[in-house]
Every structure is written in structure tokens, then in C-alpha cells.
Amino acid sequence: SYSMEHFRWGKPVGKKRRPVKVYPNGAEDESAEAFPLEF
């Protein structure tokens, strides 16, 4: 269980997800751009 406070839907307060994946190479591209900064 998390030690930090929860919202009622179960996500820990302040836990930040990674950035959204980017697909810069058009419709044919299945692979996402790597992130320059990892969380």
C-alpha cells in the first residue's frame, strides 16, 4: 500500500507519469521517439 495520501480513485497524489509518446515520422512510424529526460 502507498504511504502517501490517495484520491478516491486510487492514484497516489503527486505521482507524475512520463511524458506522452511522440510519433514524429508520419503514418508509417510505429516506434515512439525516446525521451530526452527520464523520470
Epitope: F7, W9, K11, P12, V13, G14, K15, K16, R17, R18, P19, V20, K21, V22, Y23, P24, G26, A27, D29, E30, A32, E33, P36, L37, F39
Partner: antibody, heavy 113, light 112 residues
Framework: EVQLVESGGGLVQPGGSLRLSCAAS????????MIWVRQAPGKGLESIGI???????YYANSAKGRFTISRDNSKNTLYLQMNSLRAEDTAVYYC???????WGQGTLVTVSS | DIQMTQSPSTLSASVGDRVTITCRAS??????LAWYQQKPGKAPKLLIY???KLASGVPSRFSGSGSGTEFTLTISSLQPDDFATYYC??????????????FGGGTKVEIK
């Protein structure tokens, strides 16, 4: 061909509900981050919410408590359930594959009595 | 939620002009910023991601810069096809208390 096709838009009364669908082809929805975006007539783009590849969902303040994003992996389809609709929810709704040029054609939702 | 503020809202320019659009985030988003171009009745087109990287097929006259909270999109020499509306978009990670995906209000580039 990589493609997103939205459906389910239409005229709904204030307070009503609607479920939009976004059918994907050429890629697997569950492997990618998917965003719902809307655009009111003559206005700018507004992000509604995101479902990450792992199924985690997050919403803009304007959508929290009223809108729910889900997906059906077997149908390779994304959904936007919209409840307690208001006149200001009138817009073209797009589904988008992450940050990319993969946008659906949009579906118009009109909330009016 | 992250708020994105774009300026100007409308810009009048001529073919050949150098055009600069500014986008400000309400909190630091590192370089997780994209720029889109939209024409009437069409879905937006990705121009720039990661603040300064050109998406596939985008002409080199488009460039982006910035990090943290201040970003700019520059068109070095405006072409007839560039008259459109431009949007910045943050795509930073979301949390339960802050949604990280937001668009600026748009900048319409019109013919002077």
C-alpha cells in the same frame, strides 16, 4: 494504413450522455498513448484526457467527473463516455495517437435543447 | 492543469516575412512541447516536437526553441502555404493533481 475513425457524435440534450468511439487500424491502440481532443466551432484545440499504454487515465479539469476514457483491446477501439453534457461541450471531438499526425477525422457533438 | 498561453492571437504578415510566435507554460515542462499547424476544416499537422525537432516532411523554414516555460516557433520566410493557425501543445507527464497535456489558444497567421 494507419488510421483513426471516430463515430458516435450527434445532437444531444443538455444533461444527456453520449459515447464516442475511435476505431484504429494499422496499429494496436493498447500499445500507445491515446488522447482525446476537442474543438468548439471557430475556437481552439482543447485536450480532454489521455489513456496511457498501460491503461492509466488522466483528465483535464473540464472533463473530470463527467468524461471517461476507456478502450476495448479486442476491438482495437478507444471510447469517450460523456455524461452531464452542457452546451459548452458542443465541439468536434478528435482522437489522437500520442503526439503525432495520426488524428481521426473528428465527430461533431452538438448539445442543445 | 498546465496552462499554455500563446501570443499573439492574430498576426498579419506578408510572403517572405520572418514570423515569430511565443508560447508560455504555467509551470516548467522541460522540452515537452510540440507545435501544430491547422487549416480550416482539417485536422492539425505536427510541425515540431521536443521544442526544437522537426517532424517528418516539415520544411526547414520552420524552427522551434525554448525550454522550461518559454518557447518560440519561427518561420524564417513565410510562404503562401503557411497562412494558417498555429498551436503549441505541452505533453509533459500528468499526475492525479495536474493534467500535463494542454494547448495554447492558437495564433492565426493571416495575409497583411
Amino acid at each position: 494504413e494507419v488510421q483513426l475513425v471516430e463515430s458516435g457524435g450527434g445532437l444531444v440534450q443538455p444533461g444527456g450522455s453520449l459515447r464516442l468511439s475511435c476505431a484504429a487500424s494499422g496499429f494496436t491502440v493498447s500499445k500507445h498513448d491515446m488522447i482525446w481532443v476537442r474543438q468548439a466551432p471557430g475556437k481552439g484545440l482543447e485536450s480532454i484526457g489521455i489513456i496511457y499504454d498501460d491503461g492509466d487515465t488522466y483528465y483535464a479539469n473540464s472533463a473530470k467527473g463527467r468524461f471517461t476514457i476507456s478502450r476495448d483491446n479486442s476491438k482495437n477501439t478507444l471510447y469517450l463516455q460523456m455524461n452531464s453534457l452542457r452546451a459548452e461541450d458542443t465541439a468536434v471531438y478528435y482522437c489522437v495517437k500520442g503526439v503525432s499526425n495520426i488524428w481521426g477525422q473528428g465527430t461533431l457533438v452538438t448539445v442543445s435543447s | 492543469d498546465i496552462q499554455m498561453t500563446q501570443s499573439p492571437s492574430t498576426l498579419s504578415a506578408s510572403v517572405g516575412d520572418r514570423v515569430t510566435i511565443t508560447c508560455r507554460a504555467s509551470q516548467s515542462i522541460s522540452v515537452y512541447l510540440a507545435w501544430y499547424q491547422q487549416k480550416p476544416g482539417k485536422a492539425p499537422k505536427l510541425l515540431i516536437y521536443q521544442a526544437s525537432k522537426l517532424a517528418s516532411g516539415v520544411p526547414s523554414r520552420f524552427s522551434g526553441s525554448g525550454s522550461g516555460t518559454e518557447f518560440t516557433l519561427t518561420i524564417s520566410s513565410l510562404q503562401p502555404d503557411d497562412f494558417a493557425t498555429y498551436y503549441c501543445q505541452s505533453y509533459d507527464g500528468s499526475s492525479s493533481s495536474s493534467y500535463g497535456v494542454g494547448f495554447g489558444g492558437g495564433t492565426k497567421v493571416e495575409i497583411k
